[in-house]
Structure formats: structure tokens, C-alpha cells
């Protein structure tokens, strides 16, 4: 009778095992093992027992011990079961971002692993089991469908294999796939709201605001604001499920014309976009041209107003004739015109909006000097010892210099409070002088002596 020990072995792939072949007869003619595996005989004294080291066991095998005794030949098999954990446990790739409400199919593929009867595939969300199935086929494939919810955001999905060899006195061998982290999102069907100026003047700054509600997770939303090819750099403010992106936009002469303002919101693998046109225009203030900004009284003055070729101007409230970008008026300069403002208002239509620009210039009229009775009386009579203020105002532009002298030397203190004395009496020659010329006027001061009773 041939016997084998152990009769059943479970061993790791590539492992070795010692198999003892024994026979019940004392002097067997033959005792050995039949196996395709590499083997070594581990010698022992005696004839009725042989120990073999079988090595590099890659797959299940049934080595057979045999013996030839006087009473006949017999055999005994040992069953070698190889175990090994799967070489590949993988979740089929999925886009990391998934919209809420979508059905997501998780597919786990398992390559290798044995014995298959002890191999189970488990699909998990975090530590929660979603599906558990025995590994069948090569590669084994297990799938499950998940309805994507908001609270799945950031959840880790994985696939685990369990090679349970505890019934065989070994352990539970687990292999886990790389996790798939689900990013859920909600991007509303409504496009973002874009608030911006419809028209923007060259070399100025405008403010653009792009906003959208009903986003999840709002902090992951990417906002792209651009005017033509110019990428804007917005400051984004987040609410619970909304954002507002505010950016300053500066335009130059190169941007003139109709430009496309874009606000794109990207969340997950989806985007929403709003387009708006902005007209960039150049409209310098109109030019007010005076023949000369400073003229002498009586000079003919031409006032011209020139604006953007497509503008319409009014000069001092009078529209150009014909209506257009130029207007002018002629006048003879009078002292009353000194300091007079000439205002030109230009109006330009840009993308249906009327834009107004103004420019003002002031005319200076040189005149005088003047000394007249109203402002410089020719006769003063004052009681002696009274307090008086001699007044004489010379007019002209530029303002004349005024001096009043008696006998060419004694000055009359104009604009100063004085005590009237006999010395003050007399005739004074008041002289007003400016770059425009000189005028004189005689002023007589009479002093009344007190009457003694």
C-alpha cells in the first residue's frame, strides 16, 4: 500500500513543498514520485519512505507516489493547490467629474488570482460595499451602477479582491485597486449673467461683472473673462452656490471697434458661456480754437469748434450750420467779452448711445485804462478832523496802476482811512497806467474848517 503525506497542500505560487512517499512493505522494489515539477530527494535511511522537495510550483498539480511491492503496484496522489493574489485589480477609468443625477457605471477588472473558488470581488464607496461577486472569467469583471448624488462629492470608489484562505488555515488576502475619487457637480443650464458697459472709450477703464447661481461645488468653478484676445483677471467672490467675478477692463486705440466680451464658466467637464459685444470707441473732446486767446478791445475774434468727424457740435448752445463736426462765430472784442467762456459741446452716436463731450475756452480782452466819475469822483469835501477814505477805482485789463499826487509829490492815500487835515486840501492828478496806455483825472479835495461861534 502506497501513502503520501500531506495528501492536500495549499501553497503560494512559486513555492516549495515537501512530499513524503511511503510504502507499507519493507523491501519495495520501487518507491518514487511522478511529477513534472522540479524535485529533489531529501535522503533518509531506510527503504520504505522517501521525501521529495517539489519546487517552483506555479499551478495546481497532482504529484503521484508509487511503489512496487511483492504484492503488487500501488499509487497515491497528493493535491497541490497554488494560491496567488490577482496581478491586476483595476477600476475602469472614468472622468473624475460627474454631473449630479447621472448614472455612473463602475467596472472592476481582475486579472489572475487563485484559487478562483476562494476569490471574491467587492466594489466599494469608501468602506461601504456596493456589490460583492465571485471572480468569474479572465479577466473577471464586476460592474455596478451608481446614481450620482451631491453628497458623493469627494467620495472614493474602489475595488477590492478577497482571497479567503482562512478555511485552509491561512489568512484573508486583500488587494485593493487605486481609488477613483468622484467629483460631482451641478452646472445650471442658464448661462452666466454678464454686466458690462456696451460702449467703452479708448484709454479708459470699465468694470465687467459675471455671475451665476445654482453651482456645486462653487469653489471648483473656473471663470474665464475675456475681451477679444485680452484675458481679464477677475476678483471672484463666492456665495453658497453662486459666484460673482468682477474685473477691470482697459482698452487702447488698438482695440477700437466691436469686440466680443466672453464669460465662460467651467465646472467639471461642462461649461456655460455668455457673449456680449462691446464697442470700443475713440472720441476726443472737441477743440475750441480762438484766433488769439488774448486780444485788444475792438479786435475781430474768430471762435472755432472742431470735433470728431462723426460728431455734431453746438457752440455756445448754437448748433453748427449745417449740423456737423465744425462750428464758428465772429465777434468784435469789447471789455464785456473779457473772461467770456466759449463752450463747444460735441455729440457722437456709438452703438445707439449718445456720447457727449465738452470743451470750454476763455477770451481775454485787453482794454483801458479808465477813470470815470462813477468810480473816481472829481470832487471831495470833507470836514477837518473827520475820518475819511479816499476812493478812486481805475478800470482796465490788465488792471492799471493808480497814483494820485498833489504838486507831483504829495500822494492821496487811496483806499486808506485818514484824518482830514488842512494839508490834504488841494487838487490831485490821478494817473492810471497799464500796458494798454495811460489816463489822468483831476481830483479836488476841499477841507471845511470848523465854525467858531
Amino acid at each position: 500500500q502506497t501513502s503520501v503525506s500531506p495528501s492536500k497542500v495549499i501553497l503560494p505560487r512559486g513555492g516549495s513543498v515537501l512530499v513524503t512517499c511511503s510504502t507499507s512493505c519493507d523491501q519495495p522494489k520501487l518507491l518514487g514520485i511522478e511529477t513534472p515539477l522540479p524535485k529533489k530527494e531529501l535522503l533518509l535511511p531506510g527503504n520504505n519512505r522517501k521525501v521529495y522537495e517539489l519546487s517552483n510550483v506555479q499551478e495546481d498539480s497532482q504529484p503521484m507516489c508509487y511503489s512496487n511491492c511483492p504484492d503488487g503496484q500501488s499509487t497515491a496522489k497528493t493535491f497541490l493547490t497554488v494560491y496567488w493574489t490577482p496581478e491586476r485589480v483595476e477600476l475602469a477609468p472614468l472622468p473624475s467629474w460627474q454631473p449630479v443625477g447621472k448614472n455612473l457605471t463602475l467596472r472592476c477588472q481582475v486579472e489572475g488570482g487563485a484559487p478562483r473558488a476562494n476569490l471574491t470581488v467587492v466594489l466599494l464607496r469608501g468602506e461601504k460595499e456596493l456589490k460583492r461577486e465571485p471572480a468569474v472569467g479572465e479577466p473577471a469583471e464586476v460592474t455596478t451602477t451608481v446614481l450620482v448624488r451631491r453628497d458623493h462629492h469627494g467620495a472614493n470608489f474602489s475595488c477590492r479582491t478577497e482571497l479567503d484562505l482562512r478555511p485552509q488555515g491561512l489568512e484573508l488576502f486583500e488587494n485593493t485597486s487605486a481609488p477613483y475619487q468622484l467629483q460631482t457637480f451641478v452646472l445650471p443650464a442658464t448661462p452666466p449673467q454678464l454686466v458690462s458697459p456696451r460702449v467703452l472709450e479708448v484709454d479708459t477703464q470699465g468694470t465687467v461683472v459675471c455671475s451665476l447661481d445654482g453651482l456645486f461645488p462653487v469653489s471648483e468653478a473656473q471663470v474665464h473673462l475675456a475681451l477679444g484676445d485680452q484675458r481679464l483677471n477677475p476678483t471672484v467672490t463666492y456665495g453658497n452656490d453662486s459666484f460673482s467675478a468682477k474685473a477691470s477692463v482697459s482698452v487702447t486705440a488698438e482695440d477700437e471697434g466691436t469686440q466680443r466680451l466672453t464669460c465662460a464658466v467651467i465646472l467639471g467637464n461642462q461649461s456655460q458661456e455668455t457673449l456680449q459685444t462691446v464697442t470700443i470707441y475713440s472720441f476726443p473732446a472737441p477743440n475750441v480754437i480762438l484766433t488769439k486767446p488774448e486780444v485788444s478791445e475792438g479786435t475781430e475774434v474768430t471762435v472755432k469748434c472742431e470735433a470728431h468727424p462723426r460728431a455734431k457740435v453746438t457752440l455756445n448752445g448754437v448748433p453748427a450750420q449745417p449740423l456737423g463736426p465744425r462750428a464758428q462765430l465772429l465777434l468784435k472784442a469789447t471789455p464785456e467779452d473779457n473772461g467770456r467762456s466759449f463752450s463747444c459741446s460735441a455729440t457722437l452716436e456709438v452703438a445707439g448711445q449718445l456720447i457727449h463731450k465738452n470743451q470750454t475756452r476763455e477770451l481775454r480782452v485787453l482794454y483801458g485804462p479808465r477813470l470815470d466819475e462813477r468810480d473816481c469822483p472829481g470832487n471831495w469835501t470833507w470836514p477837518e478832523n473827520s475820518q475819511q477814505t479816499p476812493m478812486c477805482q481805475a478800470w482796465g485789463n490788465p488792471l492799471p496802476e493808480l497814483k494820485c499826487l498833489k504838486d507831483g509829490t504829495f500822494p492821496l492815500p487811496i483806499g486808506e482811512s485818514v484824518t482830514v487835515t488842512r494839508d490834504l486840501e488841494g487838487t490831485y492828478l490821478c494817473r492810471a497806467r497799464s500796458t494798454q496806455g495811460e489816463v489822468t483825472r483831476k481830483v479836488t479835495v476841499n477841507v471845511l474848517s470848523p465854525r467858531y461861534e
Epitope: K40, L42, L43, P45, E53
Partner: antibody
Framework: EVQLVESGGGLVQPGGSLRLSCAAS????????IHWVRQAPGKGLEWVAR????????IYADSVKGRFTISSDDSKNTAYLQMNSLRAEDTAVYYC?????????WGQGTLVTVSS | DIQMTQSPSSLSASVGDRVTITCRAS??????LHWYQQKPGKAPKLLIY???QSISGVPSRFSGSGSGTDFTLTISSLQPEDFATYYC?????????FGQGTKVEIK
Amino acid sequence: EVQLVESGGGLVQPGGSLRLSCAASGFNIKDTYIHWVRQAPGKGLEWVARIDPANDNTIYADSVKGRFTISSDDSKNTAYLQMNSLRAEDTAVYYCTTSGYWFAYWGQGTLVTVSS
Amino acid sequence: DIQMTQSPSSLSASVGDRVTITCRASQSISNNLHWYQQKPGKAPKLLIYHASQSISGVPSRFSGSGSGTDFTLTISSLQPEDFATYYCQQSNSWPYTFGQGTKVEIK
């Protein structure tokens, strides 16, 4: 009948070399493993080296690694232990033995004395 | 390396006595332990392999037991030819190592 016979021992100066032989009979060395085990005078047993004659796979004790080389010749059914850079502490009876994990058959031993 | 410690180092016993020798491994070696008997001037002789497996031609009074780290060789009734030195050896991992030996002497 399984038999192992060692030869090649003797007196050698420190730093010298010796080559021990182990002639096997009654079995084919390719079908098992051959080991060398030594025993210093009055001391215990120390495993030295092992060879798998089927593929010349070898393993050594740290104390002899780099100095001793175990080899085999299938045609002669003989294993060898080449000992170089010998030291006084290598003085021992060297046994050739067979089997894989245990040592079922031993030779009679050959004495190696390292002394100046 | 796995250290093997035998106890006692020596013992005196009389013919017919039951003798027990223990061997302790510095770490678990499963059942990869073997026992040898050596008489002066002779090569060692295998008595037990794999902790408890008997050898053809070895008297049945020799038996072995144990697993993991603690092992025992028992001679149920000591005979005159059993006075010798006994060694344990582990084959769990390289390098294979022996115990320091236990000398059994006549009392």
C-alpha cells in the same frame, strides 16, 4: 547503499589554501543537495556551505563567504570545497553531508589544521 | 541568524532513566527542527527530523516533540549505547544553525 567519503584535509599555514573532495556513491548527487559542516576540536557543529548540483546554486555561512567555494562535478558524482585565505579559526573536522533540510548521511570527516 | 539554545549543556543519568533534552529557537521555526547523536570521533547521526518524525533504524525510545520555538528530545529508557552528545539543528532559514550540544554521561 549511500556513502560519502571526504579527502584533501591536512596541515596548512594561515593564508594558505586547501581543496576538500566528497565522493558520493549509492545515489546521484544531482538528485539532492550536498552540504559541508565543520566541527572545531572539542566544539559544536557549524554549517558551512550548500550546493544544488543540478544548477550549481550555492549558499555560504558568513564566516566563510568570499574565502570558500563549494562546487560539484556530476560526471564524478563528487562535491568540492575550495578553501582559500585560511585562518587558525578554520581548524576543524570537515564533514560532507547530504539531504536538504536535515543531514541524513555523513562522511567520516577530514581534519584541516591551520597553523604556522 | 536564528540562535539555538540547548539545555542542559550536560547531564548525568543512569541506564533505564527517562532523559529529556530541550532546544529553544530565538524565533519561530515551525517544525523545521532536527536532532542528531554524536559519539566521540564519529560523524553525527540523524535521530529525528521535522521535530517528531522518526528515522528508520533509530530505536523507538528516541522521540521528538514541539513546534514554533520550543522542542524536546526524549529518550524513554536510557541504554548504555546512548551516552553521547546530542545536537538540535534548524532549517527554517539560512544559515542553518545548530545548538551548542548536550552531553549525556553515565552517572
